[in-house]
Amino acid sequence: SIPWNLERITPPRYRADEYQPPDGGSLVEVYLLDTSIQSDHREIEGRVMVTDFENVPEEDGTRFHRQASKCDSHGTHLAGVVSGRDAGVAKGASMRSLRVLNCQGKGTVSGTLIGLEFIRKSQLVQPVGPLVVLLPLAGGYSRVLNAACQRLARAGVVLVTAAGNFRDDACLYSPASAPEVITVGATNAQDQPVTLGTLGTNFGRCVDLFAPGEDIIGASSDCSTCFVSQSGTSQAAAHVAGIAAMMLSAEPELTLAELRQRLIHFSAKDVINEAWFPEDQRVLTPNLVAALPPSTHGAGWQLFCRTVWSAHSGPTRMATAIARCAPDEELLSCSSFSRSGKRRGERMEAQGGKLVCRAHNAFGGEGVYAIARCCLLPQANCSVHTAPPAEASMGTRVHCHQQGHVLTGCSSHWEVEDLGTHKPPVLRPRGQPNQCVGHREASIHASCCHAPGLECKVKEHGIPAPQGQVTVACEEGWTLTGCSALPGTSHVLGAYAVDNTCVVRSRDVSTTGSTSEEAVTAVAICCRSRHLAQASQELQ
Amino acid sequence: QEDEDGDYEELVLALRSEEDGLAEAPEHGTTATFHRCAKDPWRLPGTYVVVLKEETHLSQSERTARRLQAQAARRGYLTKILHVFHGLLPGFLVKMSGDLLELALKLPHVDYIEEDSSVFAQ
């Protein structure tokens, strides 16, 4: 019967007594940077070309015996998970292996860098189809390794890496912390984060998604027909590399940004038990388990968006945090979140010719996060319209005045320390969909976009008194682009998007007392692109 | 265990070269930075990735590496250029004493230097 991990990533329409989705990634080459591998194992023979690249440190210890099967164990298993005949994800994908890890599974940042450079040079000498690079390894945070990954990604290569097995914030490790890399955490058959001895899968905002990574059956280097079960974020990353290979084989022109958005979009949502993660990491960690798209050709008509969290600002009075979208994504909205509730809002601003989302800490605050909503919107022309604090009037207003521009998000930023003592800011596009309304002492920022066929609407959901969390979701066919809170009292910790749901968090006021005036409303801006939908129908 | 100095066998004890005196001084106002792994057991002191500024050509990378060797030799230090990077990042990998970091950070075109560190199968 089909192994649990292959069943988990397979949409129901492919499920039979065996895993055989269409097109096994045959147009794609997957590079594996790992240990040596047993390339003629029955499961992978003819699928893996062992390059002559080898850059590994000496094994530790004077009495270390190089036993071939042990030296090949990790890499052989991963090659099998990616493209194995019987237990592989992308059965048609061809692979090339580079040896950067020694027989003890240890390598160096410099060896990995030279390996990545080798791949780039190979790509230049003999350009082929789409390339996926699998990095099933992790070390401490490395500026240079992250930089090399960024360069390779900008050259059109898709990099997939293990989040790390340290039960820790993946942002403390490389290449997991590189924003351009697709970073994968591990879950088990019960959709629980994987525990590995006293440690387990890494987590946090640097993880893009999770994938099966416990008791994964794959090729064993013990013999040419042997299989073995292994666990780890390497195995999880290998699943995503396989899924990426299949997606790219079906749509070879996909950019990295498009691929990442599709991986997120087609993932199983909200199935991971978040209680396993440290409390302060739960909101930052994506609750997504990778899966293949339900059809070979992905939903090109869809407006894809994802949520990007910044690093924590730190607690200083003037501290700020910045969240950035990938180069070919549009920042459609910006929100902020603070566990203490002490923040001074957020704003969208240009930095290096690109919009970024900046959140501001407030005096006495423990720090803030900026949350960017990053979307794929072809031919978009987006701008930010800002209204300075209105001071005297009832509130500050700003709208999208250009013809054909629609409102995709509202942000509010204030200089006063605590708006809770003032009339609360109101980001209220209601009634006038192209308008943001806010507190008279706040500057209000409207994200206004023009794109073919783009239409947006506002959805609100309010509850009489703050109850910790208020949500509002966009309906089927619409995509959440903006998420904000009404009102913005000191009770409100912030707003952020989780998949297609706008979440507004507020302090539990059972201890502080509340009034009906302090009702909290979650405001979602939901958009869709008729142009993309029409283009997709014409293709069919 | 093999002789730890084995790696140094091919080291070039670079003598002061004419080129050494001619190389450009580092640009004013830009200070190269040094980075190392926050996890102490994973550090590999003695090997450093010298990353040069983005538009640096291969010939400049090689020249900078040679200049480091020459200046180190003048101070009585052996260095070994293990690899010159080009294609992804401009720079070079050098085996040298940590005593030379201050000197290396002052070389022209240097953006930052990172001490090598371990990575592990996950």
Epitope: G46, R85, D86 | -
Partner: antibody, heavy 115, light 109 residues
Framework: QVQLVQSGAEVKKPGASVKVSCKAS????????ISWVRQAPGQGLEWMGW????????NYAQKVQGRVTMTTDTSTSTVYMELRSLRSDDTAVYYC????????WGQGTTVTVSS | QSALTQPASVSGSPGQSITISCTGT?????????VSWYQQHPGKPPKLMIY???NRPSGVSNRFSGSKSGNTASLTISGLQAEDEADYFC?????????FGGGTKLTVL
């Protein structure tokens, strides 16, 4: 192009040994092992075993285990199959084929065991 | 006695379609994606026609197709031609080895 070239026909007496060679070319040798298959006159195909060109590991069919030895010489890209204690029912055409997938075959070597 | 069961012979007229079955168990055909089909003309080595149940190597006519259901694999030849007359063998992985079918003689009438 990908090729497997085998040694010539052999006539052996019962109890003797035979060693058939198979020279591989045109592909990365370590990406595939070599399978050996035999076919008795007028009969079907019988898989005898496999040898790794990567590390020399072998996987023999139970029926010939103990009588067969497969070896490789990586310097000449040649694989050998030696069958000992020959019997008359070992008379067959012996083929080498690439990997377990057996996508490329040698031309065959006829081994006749007769007293 | 071969591990996989094939009909001893099948026949068909030119232009017709024929199907050859190959029946095994859940330990071979049913348990793996690696069923292959070989064509063998007299005095020649076998030639791979189908691999991994339904894939055709380059150079093999698209008149040849493979499929599998449960423990039985099938080879279908459509638009039968005179040169298709040959012996056909199926093979499958087992947990540690390979097994062949006894072979099917295809006669083109």
């Amino acid at each position: 192009q990908v090729q497997l070239v085998q040694s010539g026909a052999e006539v052996k007496k019962p109890g003797a040994s035979v060693k058939v060679s198979c020279k591989a070319s045109g592909y990365p040798l370590t990406s595939y092992g070599i399978s050996w298959v035999r076919q008795a006159p007028g009969q079907g195909l019988e898989w005898m075993g496999w040898i790794s060109a990567y590390n020399g590991n072998t996987n023999y069919a139970q029926k010939v285990q103990g009588r067969v030895t497969m070896t490789t010489d990586t310097s000449t890209s040649t694989v050998y199959m030696e069958l000992r204690s020959l019997r008359s029912d070992d008379t067959a055409v012996y083929y080498c084929a690439r990997g377990y997938g057996m996508d490329v075959w040698g031309q065959g070597t006829t081994v006749t065991v007769s007293s | 006695q071969s591990a996989l069961t094939q009909p001893a012979s099948v026949s068909g007229s030119p232009g017709q379609s024929i199907t050859i079955s190959c029946t095994g168990t859940s330990s071979d055909v049913g348990g793996y994606n690696s069923v292959s089909w070989y064509q063998q003309h007299p005095g020649k080595p076998p030639k791979l026609m189908i691999y991994e149940v339904s894939n055709r190597p380059s150079g093999v006519s698209n008149r040849f197709s493979g499929s599998k259901s449960g423990n039985t694999a099938s080879l279908t030849i459509s638009g039968l031609q005179a040169e298709d007359e040959a012996d056909y063998f199926c093979s499958s992985y087992t947990s540690t080895s390979m097994v062949f079918g006894g072979g099917t003689k295809l006669t083109v009438l």
